[in-house]
């Protein structure tokens, strides 16, 4: 399969974020980052990592979404939702479900 | 297998123009960046263009900014090269090659571009 | 734009030599440096990626180091196929530049 060659010690990631030097990057690892600022869109931003493993494993939450992955270009087709608010009015367990 | 074929060289006038093409088959050509590259006759390498797997970003050569256009057509797994306003020393081999995205490493067989009155 | 330095510009050399070949970036590039081969007539091939990476099939007397600005390109001992013009490209920053390109020439 000529899209998966032999691993080396680093990956080869799509970038695409207002950072990147190039279209991609190279790093131990590949990242694609949900980010939603107040009163904007959310914004995907995809990239290398390198630092701080540890954001991989954390919950989306409304207002950010991190992802990692370990192989060559895996962050280039991977789509992210943030965690869904819910309105005052429709708190859990008072719908009669 | 991996393929990249080049075509849409030939002649052409100082201050012409020229399209280069790419066909790509055998790889996920959607997800990979890729770039044009140039020899001139008995010379180097001389990076030219690349653009990102989506086509949003796109990045040149200050000796071609301006004057050159990359795109891609994913539907099409085609990649292409807009030339504009050619000059003598525009006249090279031109290749289509997956670089920048190592360790993929396709290149096609080039076509040949000469800017000659 | 980075400049790439590369030397020298040709290289006499024979089979079973140790010969080493020079790349110098004008600014910081920390590893993010390739080799490229090319034979007449044929489009280059990709030998070591990433400063020391080797690229799958590649043979290991092929060795690459560097840091920063100055870089390396290693061949243990020549072999015949081995004759053919050396390239360093840097793709840590947009535009990328290659070097001028080392010809390997048998003496």
């Known amino acids: 399969d000529p899209v998966k060659p032999s691993r080396g010690p680093l990956v080869t990631c799509t970038c695409e974020s207002p950072h990147c030097k190039g279209p991609t990057c190279r790093g131990a690892w590949c990242t694609v980052v949900l980010v939603r600022e107040e009163g904007r869109h959310p914004q995907e931003h995809r990239g290398c990592g390198n630092l701080h493993r540890e954001l991989c494993r954390g919950r989306p939450t409304e207002f950010v979404n991190h992802y990692c992955c370990d192989s060559h270009l895996c962050n280039h087709n991977v789509s992210l939702v943030l965690e869904a608010t819910q309105p005052p009015s429709e708190q859990p367990g008072t719908d009669g479900q | 297998e991996v393929q990249l074929l080049e075509s849409g060289g030939g002649l052409v006038q100082p201050g012409g123009s020229l399209r280069l093409s790419c066909a790509a088959s055998?790889?996920?050509?959607?997800?990979?960046?890729m770039s044009w590259v140039r020899q001139a006759p008995g010379k180097g390498l001389d990076w030219v263009s690349a653009?990102?797997?989506?086509?949003?970003?796109?990045y040149y050569a200050d000796s071609v900014k301006g004057r050159f256009t990359i795109s891609r057509d994913n539907s099409k797994n085609t990649l292409f090269l807009q030339m504009n306003s050619l000059r003598a020393e525009d006249t090279a081999v031109y290749y289509c090659?997956?670089?920048?995205?190592?360790?993929?490493?396709?290149w096609g067989q080039g076509t040949l571009v000469t800017v000659s009155s | 734009a980075i400049q790439m330095t590369q030397s020298p510009s040709s290289l006499s050399a024979s089979v079973g030599d140790r010969v080493t070949i020079t790349c110098r970036a004008s600014?910081?590039?920390?590893?993010?440096l390739g080799w490229y081969q090319q034979r007449p007539g044929k489009a280059p091939q990709l030998l070591i990626y990433?400063?020391?990476i080797l690229q799958s099939g590649v043979p290991s007397r092929f060795s690459g180091s560097g840091s920063g600005t100055v870089f390396t390109l290693t061949i243990s001992s020549l072999q015949p196929e081995d004759f053919a013009t050396y390239y360093c490209?840097?793709?840590?920053?947009?535009?990328?530049?290659f070097g001028q390109g080392t010809k390997l020439e048998i003496k």
């Open positions: 090659a997956s670089q920048p995205t190592p360790p993929f490493d396709y």
């Open positions: 055998g790889f996920a050509f959607n997800s990979f960046a």
């Open positions: 653009i990102g797997g989506r086509g949003g970003s796109t």
């Open positions: 600014q910081d590039i920390r590893n993010d």
């Open positions: 990433a400063t020391s």
């Open positions: 490209l840097q793709d840590y920053n947009y535009p990328c530049n």
